[in-house]
């Protein structure tokens, strides 16, 4: 009796299994190692990459598709030979039998054999669509594959024009070295004329500041009768301040000025005076809700407001919507400043955006974005970047255009997963992206490898997690 | 572990002064701002001054401000509060605090040290 | 400045028992409320910030919540270790200012 059987084995083949009287045929249909099924949930076409796969690998996996649909038509024709010989040798046993048997008998026969036929070309129909199924999959494959294939062709020629533009660039720089060699020379020789013009001033000067020094000492004499009354002066005053602030101390002059001051970022505190770097009061615009921040007044020109520091993994970055909302951390080691105070600062004028990084290997990159805003938390704070810069990749590692910040509680990323849980931290997620300054702190030796460290792809890769990150903000008129 | 241990109270005559001083242990004390917090008699909490991580911003409420001054030592890890023309009604229990970071709520307390101002 | 108003002085309650303590701001302060805990003899301990996260080690049986100007601390299931002054304050800006207290007695 026919039967027709479909399974899965072990290590995932499909299993086709025709039973025809006593004996049943199995047949394996293999499937690529790296390729799932349509029925698989994850679709092959929908994958984010961080960057497209190697051109060899590309090409090797075609290869082992074209074996694949060679294998598939060795076993069809091995398939359609066997029903023949099969159909030969009952045809030639039904023939003896014939001799012997009445005519009404070899009808019979005749009709069981006509019905075996039709059954047998029925079962090989569905082994045929279930193969033609299979090989659709794999064109459709096959075409994705190609398409991937021309994007790494057409990259590959983008990077050759580029590598050629380098090396005319390259050129010029050599023709320019040389000329300031030259200048350097002729420099040289004027130095050394205005060094021995300057030897005769020194030794000039070297008398005057002789009678100079004579003419100090007696003014120090006369310094010292100045010091006596100065320092009488300051008793008297600090008398008349001591009795002020007793008659009247809400008017009390020694207040600092400092007291009656607000400052909005890092830029307005520089403005005033304070350029060390260190913690510093901010206050909300037009609000008196206040936040401390770490101020860089060092850093290209000083003024930046710190919004984010990663240096030691001492703080958990695994936080709620709330918690990035409001900020968390120590402005003097790691913290995030918060979401909503810089939404409404960087929506009340332009600010410039710099990210600073440091890999475990002593090296140091930047990105700037010459103009960068959050939308509101009605938004989500969605990040909005223009005009990147910097020598931590040529394209921009936050993707765009920009996307909703998302948290472990709070999912508005382009991803059917959720990319803040799976990669840890609150950041501005594409389906993920190519990067997560936020993700989990991995110490040196174990920072290889890790797909939800500190990544920015366009500097490091994919798998490598950074040492230490810095977000500032400045505005762009500073 | 965070320490934070206060002293100099004790009683003083109206219009007399008083320097507290708070030695601070267990955390970078040089990376926040620091702050003294009274309670009165009457269980009343008050905020009497706060100085940022490096001295240079000090801020006071209206009730003690031109006559109590705060400082720090970041060297030494002592945060002092120098009280002058002492009133009645800055009779309290002074404490030393730290906050979390980021906003002031206090984390940190110390024991206290009582200060009665008294003819 | 921003004043902080506990209308309860007192608050009876016996063990086992939940408890609502309330706090007024006078402007809204973005959640930006902490609680505090001080039993007699001792420091203030901080138990809550944000309005609704809970610091370091204090039990889960210490809940805040609230928005705007209105905020609650609620003690789920009292215990006799409970008794004590309980104060807000706001950490939304200088200066920083506190609710006038807020004793839980144990019948």
């Known amino acids: 009796y026919n039967n027709f059987r479909k399974s899965m084995d072990s290590i995932g083949k499909k299993q086709y299994q025709v039973q025809h009287g006593s004996c049943s045929y199995t047949f394996l249909l293999p499937e690529m190692d790296n390729c799932r099924s349509s029925s698989s949930p994850y679709v092959s076409n929908a994958v984010q990459r961080d960057a497209p796969l190697e051109y060899d690998d590309s090409v090797q996996r075609l290869q082992v598709l074209e074996n694949i649909m060679e294998n598939n038509t060795q076993w069809l024709m091995k398939l359609e030979n066997y029903i023949q010989d099969n159909m030969k040798k009952e045809m030639v046993e039904i023939q003896q039998n014939a001799v012997q048997n009445q005519t009404a008998v070899m009808i019979e026969i005749g009709t069981n054999l006509l019905n075996q036929t039709a059954e047998q070309t029925r079962k090989l129909t569905d082994v045929e669509a279930q193969v033609l199924n299979q090989t659709t999959r794999l064109e459709l494959q096959l075409l994705e594959h190609s398409l991937s294939t021309n994007k790494l062709e057409k990259q590959i020629l983008d990077q050759t024009s580029e590598i050629n533009k380098l090396q005319d660039k390259n050129s010029f720089l050599e023709k320019k070295v040389l000329a300031m060699e030259d200048k350097h020379i002729i420099q040289l020789q004027s130095i050394k004329e205005e060094k021995d013009q300057l030897q005769v001033l020194v030794s000039k000067q070297n008398s005057i500041i002789e009678e100079l020094e004579k003419k100090i000492v007696t003014a120090t004499v006369n310094n010292s009768v100045l010091q006596k009354q100065q320092h009488d002066l300051m008793e008297t005053v600090n008398n008349l301040l001591t009795m002020m602030s007793t008659s009247n101390s809400a008017k009390d002059p020694t207040v600092a000025k400092e007291e009656q001051i607000s400052f909005r970022d890092c830029a307005e505190v520089f403005k005033s005076g304070h350029t060390t770097n260190g913690i510093y009061t901010l206050t909300f615009p037009n609000s008196t809700e206040e936040i401390k921040a770490y101020c860089d007044m060092e850093a290209g020109g000083g003024g930046w407001t710190i919004i984010q520091r990663r240096e030691d993994g001492s703080v958990d970055f695994q936080r709620t919507w709330k918690e990035y909302k409001v900020g968390f951390g120590n402005p003097s080691g790691e913290y995030w400043l918060g979401n909503e105070f810089v939404s409404q600062l960087t929506n009340q004028q332009r600010y410039v955006l710099k990210i600073h990084l440091k890999d475990w290997e002593g090296n140091e990159a930047y990105s700037l974005y010459e103009h960068f805003y959050l939308s509101s938390e009605e938004l989500n704070y969605r990040i909005h970047l223009k005009g990147l810069t910097g020598t931590a990749g040529k394209i921009s590692s936050i993707s765009q255009p920009g996307n909703d910040f998302s948290t472990k509680d709070g999912d508005n990323d382009k991803c059917i997963c959720k990319c803040s849980q799976m990669l840890t931290g609150g950041w501005w997620f594409d389906a993920c992206g190519p990067s997560n300054l936020n993700g989990m702190y991995y110490p040196q030796r174990q920072n290889t490898n890790k797909f939800n460290g500190i990544k920015w792809y366009y500097w490091k890769g994919s798998g490598y997690s950074l040492k230490a990150t810095t977000m500032m903000i400045r505005p762009a008129d500073f | 572990e965070v320490q934070l241990v206060e002293s100099g109270g004790g009683l003083v005559k109206p219009g007399g002064s008083l320097k507290l001083s708070c030695a601070a242990s267990?955390?970078?004390?040089?990376?926040?701002?620091m702050y003294w917090v009274r309670q009165t008699p009457e269980k009343r909490l008050e905020w009497v001054a706060t100085?940022?991580?490096?001295?240079?911003?000090?801020y006071y409420p209206d009730s003690v401000k031109g006559r109590f001054t705060i400082s720090r030592d970041n060297a030494k890890n002592n945060l002092y509060l120098q009280m002058s023309s002492l009133k009645s009604e800055d009779t309290a229990m002074y404490y030393c605090?730290?906050?979390?970071?980021?906003?002031?709520?206090?984390?940190?307390w110390g024991q206290g040290t009582l200060v009665t101002v008294s003819a | 400045d921003i004043v902080m108003t506990q209308s309860h002085k007192f608050m009876s309650t016996s063990v086992g028992d939940r408890v609502s303590i309330t706090c007024k701001a006078s402007?809204?302060?973005?959640?930006?409320v902490a609680w505090y805990q001080q039993k007699p003899g001792q420091s203030p301990k901080l138990l809550i910030y944000?309005?609704?996260t809970r610091h370091t080690g204090v039990p889960d049986r210490f809940t805040g919540s609230g928005s705007g100007t209105d905020y609650t601390l609620t003690i789920s299931s009292v215990q006799a270790e409970d008794l004590a002054l309980y104060y807000c304050?706001?950490?939304?800006?200088?200066?920083?200012?506190f609710g006038s207290g807020t004793k839980l007695e144990i019948k």
């Open positions: 944000w309005a609704s």
């Open positions: 402007q809204d302060v973005s959640t930006a």
């Open positions: 304050q706001q950490h939304y800006s200088t200066p920083p200012t």
């Open positions: 267990g955390f970078t004390f040089s990376d926040y701002y």
């Open positions: 100085i940022s991580v490096g001295g240079s911003f000090t």
């Open positions: 605090a730290r906050d979390w970071g980021l906003r002031p709520w206090f984390v940190y």
